[in-house]
């Protein structure tokens, strides 16, 4: 049975330019984690297996990097990324935990109400 | 000003398929998420997703998939909720409400468009 | 999915009175940043739903300032502080800070 549950960094607004962590963490398991894949609707973003360690699509190359922990960090962010990310854990003997993100990115000159949520 | 425009009311039959439109007005469209909610029983208020026309992204509640579809026609600032495989449960007022940027709220909403599934 | 509850589900009211609506949350409403996404609604009889408060307290555009929201983590709080006829409705709040994002079950205000 599935007990675990996945806890997100929650919805995030950014800045275009800027960076963001998008981080999920699965709890209430004793299940082990074999690996973490975060996508964005059809596209791979990165693995982190627990044997091999992480592995970024050669398309996000420039932009994504690991961590922290289980986490990613997507840099110069365009208003093209806007989107919903996914944060899959693939465990043992549980199975496939799923959580969700939705990251929204402002145009500088738009930010409205002084909205300017990216990592410095 | 800020308008959302939505497709009149429909009685369909159970098993049907059917699509609501809301056009929008007054705002650079491509700039904002779209979404759709659901009223049943006349109080209920439930997200069904959205749709960010700059790239067509996409978001769903769960609880939904398979029975919506949310699409984007730039070109008409107009989006699109498909329904599909109506069943008694889905007769309901659906909203379309434009987000808020920065604050995942929904500021300027449509003006309902009521769907009765009755055979 | 977060489950959002309001209470009371019936407000009772004489105009002029000073009210409040809670809403709390399954899960804590701050996003990693610190920034939280609650909002709430007034659905008047055959209108469409419009927009309170966004961002807890931020009232919007053309919202009288006798509605005021506070809160933080999972409490929140809409308070009218002089009720006029046209406050009368349901009123909603809205988590947007998870996937996906959960309305409260109503609140009537009502006259007494």
């Known amino acids: 049975m599935m007990t675990g549950t996945i806890e997100t960094t929650g919805n995030i607004s950014a800045e275009k330019g800027g960076s963001i962590i998008l981080q999920c963490h699965l709890s209430s398991t004793t299940a082990q984690v074999t690996q973490v894949n975060w996508e964005q609707q059809d596209q791979l973003l990165a693995i982190c297996n627990a044997d091999l360690g992480w592995h970024i699509s050669p398309s996000f190359k420039d932009r994504v990097a690991p961590g922290p922990g289980l986490g990613l960090t997507l840099q110069s962010l365009t208003v093209n990324d806007t989107g919903e990310y996914f944060c899959i854990y693939h465990t043992y003997p549980d199975g496939t935990y799923t959580g969700r993100i939705f990251l929204e990115v402002l145009e500088s000159s738009v930010a409205e109400h002084g909205a300017r949520f990216q990592i410095p | 000003e800020v308008q959302l425009q939505q497709s009149g009311p429909e009685l369909v039959k159970p098993g049907v398929s059917m699509k609501i439109s809301c056009k929008a007005s007054?705002?650079?469209?491509?700039?904002?998420?779209m979404n759709w909610v659901k009223q049943s029983h006349g109080k209920n208020l439930e997200w069904l997703g959205l749709?960010?026309?700059?790239?067509?992204?996409?978001s769903y509640n769960q609880k939904f998939t398979g029975k919506a579809t949310i699409t984007v026609d730039k070109s008409s600032n107009t989006t699109y909720m498909e329904l599909f495989s109506l069943t008694s449960e889905d007769s309901a007022v659906y909203y379309c409400?434009?987000?808020?940027?920065?604050?995942?709220?929904?500021?300027?909403w449509g003006q309902g468009t009521s769907v009765t599934v009755s055979s | 999915d977060v489950v959002m509850t309001q209470t009371p589900l019936s407000l009772p009211v004489s105009f002029g009175d000073q009210v409040s609506i809670s809403c709390r949350s399954s899960?804590?409403?701050?996003?990693?940043?610190?920034?939280?996404?609650l909002s709430w609604y007034l659905h008047k009889p055959g209108q469409s739903p419009h927009l309170l408060i966004y961002?807890?307290?931020n009232r919007f555009s053309g919202v009288p300032d006798r509605f005021s929201g506070s809160g933080s983590g999972t409490d929140f709080t809409l308070k009218i502080s002089t009720i006029k006829p046209e406050d009368l409705g349901m009123y909603y709040c809205?988590?947007?800070?998870?996937?996906?994002?959960?309305f409260g079950g109503g609140t009537k205000l009502e006259i007494k």
């Open positions: 409400a434009r987000g808020l940027r920065g604050f995942f709220a929904l500021d300027y």
């Open positions: 007054g705002y650079s469209f491509t700039g904002y998420t």
């Open positions: 749709i960010f026309p700059y790239n067509s992204a996409t």
């Open positions: 899960q804590s409403l701050a996003n990693s940043y610190g920034n939280t996404y």
């Open positions: 961002g807890i307290s």
């Open positions: 809205l988590q947007g800070i998870h996937q996906p994002w959960t």
